[in-house]
Interface confidence: medium
């Protein structure tokens, strides 16, 4: 393991008494069927809880909502339903919280059968609400301009695009027959519209429009659009190619002023593209395989989003529910976990530590046996349960968890064998970003990270009522239990403030007596368990991505290594809300590993050298870039996006402007070759799928 390990477990003295004095019960006099929670602002302690009870009758839904507000991280709640005039709030739109610490909140009322709708808005963290009538019925949650929370964008159920510049008081209609709309950078709005049809048919005949002045003027930036997506600095559009039903990805890095065709396989009607992750450096793109295979290929882009390297074959991404296990491990740079579908249809977990350059199986946890799925009892891997397992209703209550401020920590359900098993999983933890793993808890659990990793909290997943919470102050090595109530509750969820900086955890559930059930929450503050602030002596230096301490280049990933100050496992102290991860980067010498293969080149398997594609040998590498024909002089390498290496290997690369006008057709389907692209990809979800903080764009 990466940091010091394993003193024998001895419980913290007086923990029960300390926690008992910091456990706050709140019983809601409420029989509603569902509850949604939202934290308003960062570090404010304000939580809004919306309970909803609804019954569908014929074509309409009737119901009631109650709104509760806490100012102390959930220790107590006040019923503030009167602030929303006892109106039924649409739970499917949730509670729309404004960006940053704006304190803004929008609740959308359900006004069944009317031509308009109503919203309740707050600018003071939910202390007070005013209601505004809408001249339309929203199709989805109203969205804030990320840079100006007074400006709101909404799509109506008649596919009209509406905008308000005064936080919902006044609205103006911007456009008709709008199929999809998104905020871009600096108040830019992108949307697809069909000028002579509807959104339900004619996919592929849409115009991509842009407005930079809140709808005073519009510019058509692309035509024959199937769908579009934004990721990092990139604007992607899937465009019909003119070859029947094929479509291809075009990319822009200047908000649609200029476009280039991405070096990716075209896809047919029943396939899809999906941006799995994107930042300002690069993008992970999934291209679905033809046929209903349930898998496709992951490609990683260069810094322009134009040239792509094949990253991973047989990547699991089902058509049916649009499920993929692709997970960004936010606790360590460059690490991603996902699943592949083997030839025998079993699912195996793969991990990359270098942003998709190489993928490997997860190392078998030292304290675990290979299960009976393993052909060889001494050689097997850890396989992680994520979205796909959850969608298949396996006994997996939570997806993998990592937090940027809990450096190196990854928690996930898994099984140890040759492939994912349907058997009841256990919970595993890595403290080094996924290089090594340990079984942390037997059986399925809910888990959360508090105080930037200083405390991990877990609750057993059970169909029976529960009253025990488990916690660990040493990154999951040793666990203590605390009975938070004498009367067990039917558990529905763990809630802690996003960002993993809080020391409060709320346990939500309901109590059931002979005739009634009611919501109840228990909020536990761990501040007295971590009774002192951490000092310098509580931290130790840790080199991330270290696999061979003898090697001078040990820890080098994407051209630099990082040393972190990590909390010692033996230290029981508070990182605190203001904790900032301390890291010291150092630049590495360049090697071929720091370069991807340039246009016209590919890497043979298990080789770090890029070789010329046979069919392009001896040809001038001319291609179209920004509307001019370019001549590329290269020995086959281009630096990986975000790679900071210096010195060492330095392959020559030069692009000459051939001063000829051209159009982006260097990747018309007949010129594509599978050497660098792999095969094109499988069966397609035709609806856009939005998965918050996960999949950036699914066509």
């Amino acid at each position: 393991r990466s940091t010091e390990q394993g003193e024998s477990c001895s419980g913290l003295l007086g923990a029960d008494a300390k926690l008992a004095g910091n456990t706050h019960q709140h019983i809601f006099n409420d029989l509603s069927g569902s509850v949604s929670l939202a934290w308003v602002g960062d570090g404010t302690g304000v939580i809004l809880a919306l309970t909803t009870f609804q019954v569908p009758i014929f074509m309409i839904t009737i119901g009631q909502s109650k709104l509760y507000r806490s100012e102390d991280y959930g220790k107590s709640f006040e019923d503030v339903t009167n602030l929303i005039n006892n109106t039924f709030i649409r739970s499917d739109f949730g509670i729309a919280i404004g960006p940053e610490n704006s304190g803004k909140v929008i609740l959308t009322a359900d006004v069944s059968g009317s031509h308009g709708s109503r919203i309740f808005v707050s600018s003071d963290f939910g202390k007070s609400f005013t209601h505004q009538e809408l001249p339309f019925v929203p199709l989805m949650q109203i969205t804030y301009n990320p840079e100006n929370s007074n400006v709101l964008l909404a799509l109506s159920n008649k596919n009209e695009l509406w905008l308000s510049e005064d936080f919902g008081t006044n609205w103006k209609k911007l456009y008709d027959t709008v199929c999809l709309a998104k905020w871009g950078r600096k108040g830019t709005i992108f949307f697809t519209a069909n000028h002579n049809g509807s959104c339900s048919n004619d996919r592929g005949m849409l115009e991509l429009e842009r407005t930079t002045d809140y709808g005073k003027s519009f510019k058509t930036v692309a035509s024959k659009i199937y769908s579009f997506g934004l990721g990092g600095k990139f604007l992607f559009a899937s465009v019909m190619t003119g070859k029947g039903t094929l479509r291809a990805i075009h990319v822009s890095v200047d908000d649609g002023d200029t476009w280039n065709m991405a070096q990716l396989p075209s896809v047919g009607q029943e396939q899809f593209y999906s941006i799995l992750a994107a930042n300002d450096d690069m993008v992970f793109m999934h291209v679905d395989e033809p046929g209903d295979t349930g898998f496709g290929t992951i490609f990683t882009s260069d810094d322009r989003g134009i040239v792509y390297s094949k990253s991973l074959d047989r990547h699991l991404y089902t058509t049916t529910g649009g499920e993929t296990d692709f997970t960004n491990v936010t606790s360590l740079r460059g690490v991603y976990i996902t699943s592949v579908l083997s030839e025998d249809n079993s699912i195996q977990t793969m991990i990359t530590f270098d942003q998709g350059g190489r993928w490997t199986h997860l190392r078998k946890p030292e304290n675990s046996e290979c299960d009976a799925t393993a052909k060889n009892k001494n050689e097997c891997s850890l396989h992680i349960h994520a979205s796909y397992s959850i969608s298949q209703k396996l006994n997996v209550p939570m997806a993998p968890l990592s937090e940027p401020n809990a450096v190196g920590i990854v928690i996930a359900h898994g099984s140890v064998g040759d492939a994912i098993s349907v058997m009841v999983p256990d919970v595993y933890i890595s403290d080094d970003g996924g290089y090594s793993w340990t079984k942390m808890l037997e059986g399925p659990h809910y888990y959360t990270i508090l105080d930037s990793g200083g405390i991990i909290v877990a609750i057993e997943h059970s169909s029976r009522p529960i009253n025990v919470i488990k916690f660990s102050t040493d990154e999951g090595q040793c666990w203590q239990t605390y009975t938070f109530t004498r009367d067990p509750i039917y558990f529905t969820g763990l809630a802690s403030e996003p960002g993993a900086r809080s020391m409060n955890i709320s346990i939500w559930g309901f109590t059931e007596s002979f005739l009634t059930s009611q919501w109840v929450s228990y909020t536990i503050d761990f501040k007295d368990i971590l009774e002192r602030n951490c000092e310098e002596k509580d931290y130790t230096i840790w080199l991330a991505h270290s696999t061979d301490p003898e090697d001078y280049e040990d820890g080098c990933i994407l051209g630099y290594k990082e040393q972190f100050l990590r909390l010692r496992k033996s230290s029981v102290c508070q990182n605190g809300r203001d904790y900032v991860v301390t890291k010291q980067p150092s630049i590495c010498l360049c090697s071929l590993e720091d370069f991807l293969c340039d246009f016209g080149y590919y890497r043979p398997e298990n080789d770090s050298k890029c070789v010329e594609q046979p069919e392009l040998k001896g040809h001038d590498l001319e291609f179209c870039l920004y509307g001019r024909e370019e001549h590329l002089t290269t020995n086959g390498y281009r630096k990986i996006p975000g790679d900071k290496c210096q010195g060492g290997v330095n392959p020559v690369r030069e692009v000459k402007d051939l001063k000829k006008k051209c159009t982006s057709n260097f990747l018309s389907p007949e010129k594509q070759n599978s050497k660098s692209n792999g095969s094109a990809g499988g069966s397609g979800g035709l609806n856009d799928i939005f998965e918050a903080q996960k999949i950036e764009w699914h066509e």
């Epitope: 209903d292 295979t293 349930g294 089902t318 249809n345 009976a372 799925t373 349907v422």
Partner: antibody, heavy 121, light 109 residues
Framework: EVQLLESGGGLVQPGGSLRLSCAAS????????MNWVRQAPGKGLEWVSA????????YYADSVKGRFTISRDNSKNTLYLQMSSLRAEDTAVYYC??????????????WGQGTTVTVSS | EIVLTQSPGTLSLSPGERATLSCRAS???????LAWYQQKPGQAPRLLIY???SRATGIPDRFSGSGSGTDFTLTISRLEPEDFAVYYC??????????FGQGTKLEIK
């Protein structure tokens, strides 16, 4: 409705050949591994052969290895078993079964009605 | 090669009684990959249980499966007349890819 329908069985002499077919309907054929299972008169079930969804991987019981060939045509939703060098002990009802779908093994959840192969002189 | 041995070979019970059928593997089998089938005369087998304990679609809840490692059990809590048949256990994933037990005949007493 999910269905498998075998055909091609019959009487054949020892050393002879026969090709069994299995037409699938009601599900996405290419997403599933497929199997042949046989049952000799008055005996239990014996797995014969399996093939992956794409057709890229094939598997055989030792008793038929080198004599039987499993294949599939996903465009026609059809599974095949080419049997050669047939022996008296290959006499059985041959069932086509649906095997593993994406991800988890859910048993052989769909069976055909069976086709009878008799090897006799 | 994994050998599955079912016991008893024949089980004679009356409707309404409880039936317990056993399947023992010669070496450890993943519970994920153990299934039970029912076969009536002149019919194709029908999947009852997969993953050692999960009931297949449409199977009544009087059928249940349990066990792990080398010992697995199929239980029919209250026998109905239509339950009298031959029952096979099956493992998946080792070499050979599938192995069936020799079967247990459940007959009316």
């Amino acid at each position: 409705e999910v269905q498998l329908l075998e055909s091609g069985g019959g009487l054949v002499q020892p050393g002879g050949s026969l090709r069994l077919s299995c037409a699938a309907s009601g599900f996405t054929f290419s997403s599933y591994a497929m199997n042949w299972v046989r049952q000799a008169p008055g005996k239990g079930l014996e797995w014969v052969s399996a093939i992956s969804g794409s057709g890229g991987s094939t598997y055989y019981a030792d008793s038929v290895k080198g004599r039987f060939t499993i294949s599939r045509d996903n465009s026609k939703n059809t599974l095949y078993l080419q049997m050669s060098s047939l022996r008296a002990e290959d006499t059985a009802v041959y069932y086509c079964t649906r095997g593993r779908g994406i991800g988890y093994y859910n048993g052989m959840d769909v069976w055909g009605q069976g086709t009878t192969v008799t090897v006799s002189s | 090669e994994i050998v599955l041995t079912q016991s008893p070979g024949t089980l004679s019970l009356s409707p309404g009684e409880r039936a317990t059928l056993s399947c023992r593997a010669s070496q450890s089998v993943s519970s994920s990959y153990l299934a039970w089938y029912q076969q009536k005369p002149g019919q194709a087998p029908r999947l009852l249980i997969y993953g050692a304990s999960s009931r297949a679609t449409g199977i009544p809840d009087r059928f249940s499966g349990s066990g792990s490692g080398t010992d697995f059990t199929l239980t029919i809590s209250r026998l109905e007349p239509e339950d009298f048949a031959v029952y096979y256990c099956q493992q998946y994933g080792s070499s050979p890819m599938y192995t069936f037990g020799q079967g247990t005949k459940l007959e009316i007493k």
